[in-house]
Amino acid sequence: DWVVAPISVPENGKGPFPQRLNQLKSNKDRDTKIFYSITGPGADSPPEGVFAVEKETGWLLLNKPLDREEIAKYELYGHAVSENGASVEEPMNISIIVTDQNDNKPKFTQDTFRGSVLEGVLPGTSVMQVTATDEDDAIYTYNGVVAYSIHSQEPKDPHDLMFTIHRSTGTISVISSGLDREKVPEYTLTIQATDMDGDGSTTTAVAVVEILDANDNAPMFDPQKYEAHVPENAVGHEVQRLTVTDLDAPNSPAWRATYLIMGGDDGDHFTITTHPESNQGILTTRKGLDFEAKNQHTLYVEVTNEAPFVLKLPTSTATIVVHVEDVNEAPVFVPPSKVVEVQEGIPTGEPVCVYTAEDPDKENQKISYRILRDPAGWLAMDPDSGQVTAVGTLDREDEQFVRNNIYEVMVLAMDNGSPPTTGTGTLLLTLIDVNDHGPVPEPRQITICNQSPVRQVLNITDKDLSPHTSPFQAQLTDDSDIYWTAEVNEEGDTVVLSLKKFLKQDTYDVHLSLSDHGNKEQLTVIRATVCDCHGHVETCPGPWKGG
């Protein structure tokens, strides 16, 4: 029959070429001479001429060695024609299967593989996976079946079999306990991939296993005892730098130190922070220390890490003896801010108050006083006694110096230490109001029509405080009441001025006397411009401008 079974041809054939594969034969050759040809990739299309057929004999020939990894199967068609060129058979499929030879070594996908595993892990922990490929066939043969193995391990500490590799998957795992980053931070494994499932060609690569740090080392104080001297009252003062050593990976949470004052700081005077580079503990004062109260503090500081320990480890403790040094302390006014009520306008020389300071130092030091800031220059202070007296008129209504009835003065106390120190105090004089100002109308100029005039409402102001203000009373003087009337409203804080008789257009003085609740009287002259007009007006119409 005009059929050819699939032809198997081993790759890398040594020839000689042309090499016979099979003979195409049509049984029609009994009747007529048959000519044979082949078509398809590998024959008449790329890669051309790999296969040929002898036209008269039908012998199928291979002209070159085949490479399965390039082309694993060729599909050709055989043709049979008579001498006149007429087809005598249907085109026949010719399958040429290239059988594999173990002509490729395994190839690792990388020259160097990198993986990592935590120190101290249990055997069986997976580290990494390596991969090698082999272009040969791994389905029908073992030519491309890769088996992995570890050829060598460097260093060989604690022994030479710390890792194993799964022969099929290439997964590298820990096989022994004892991985210790502080002793061996990195292992270099020479790994092998061997085809034929371990019996063929071998290639090698390197697997670098980084041993990751676990917090299996506690930080240790070195030294464990410290003595420090600190001047009293210093806040944020660096008392001592505490040094620790930690075998774990520098700058990791397992290495970075965390300090804790375990004892000796009942008054919460100290704080300890970690220096970001050196890892030292920086002990500083949170509050000023008081030599007079306690001249020595013994602190107990414990050190741990940012990361928790992976196993139970003893914690290291340091002892710091802090000696407080005496300094000449400034006198302190008691209270630091003193509020005194005093009536405004008291006579010059009148005492205001006594304001003194105390010296924290144990020895009795002489304190002298002076005024540091007295904006209006109203006061004087006795240097020995701290007696404050009035030397000017205290004016509650002086808006330049008095805010919310309070006049603020800063005083200074100086001791006779060497060198002398000073302290300041604030004297807040609350000025008590007296009725020293009369009521004043606003505005003091008005314009009004002489026909159907509109009532003029004037606001009344008084610089004093209640009860030296409203209700106010109004009275017109100097014959102003002939033409005008003045009435205080019900609330008592405005006065209504009305024109009650016709006045010709001109400017007039209206004499208005206002008195407050304490009968303090104030006379004010209102300039009234009367215009020839009806009702409401702001300026006189026409050419007249007033005068």
């Epitope: 000689p16 070429f17 042309p18 002898e54 012998w59």
Partner: antibody
Amino acid sequence: VQLVEESGGDLVKPGGSLKLSCAASGFTFSTYGMSWVRQTPDKRLEWVATISSGGHYSYYPDSVKGRFTISRDNAKNTLYLQMSSLKSEDTAMYYCASYYYGSPFAYWGQGTTVTVSS
Amino acid sequence: ELQMTQSPSSLSASLGERVSLTCRASQDIGSSLNWLQQKPDGTIKRLIYDTSSLDSGVPKRFSGSRSGSDYSLTISSLESEDFGDYYCVQYGSSPLTFGAGTKLEIK
């Protein structure tokens, strides 16, 4: 009737070059592999070169590799052998022969003589 | 390189006599062996291919056979036109190699 006829043989100095031709007739030249074979003066036969039917692939023994080149022109039914860097041991009668039934040296020409001598 | 050892190197025989020529292959070549005949005028002709297949136009008195690595050409009854040189050639291994030849003469 299958016929092959060689030509181009000559006397040539060592290191020289020569091109032999082989004209084929009586068979479908383009579908057969072709070879050159030489017979040395001591009558020993030696394979020199083979080329595939389409001319895509060629093969040589180590003795001539790099010096001889086999080629063919199927349109002209002609086989060639370009010889260069000739040596005295290349002196021989050169035959061209065709494959047939997938087997070498089926049809032979009369041969052409190549003499390499100074 | 595969060696073909041909024997005898020369042979005298009478007309009608049965003669056998032998080639021994140094390696396995399967059935990839041809026998060639060269006439005194230098004309070369293939007699047998694939160890035992007779080329068209070759008389049936010629036959080829194989026994292991020994390959034989037998002429059952010598005729006058059979005299000349005979060569074996193998094509089972590269490079193709020839036997040294057997000179067949009339006794």
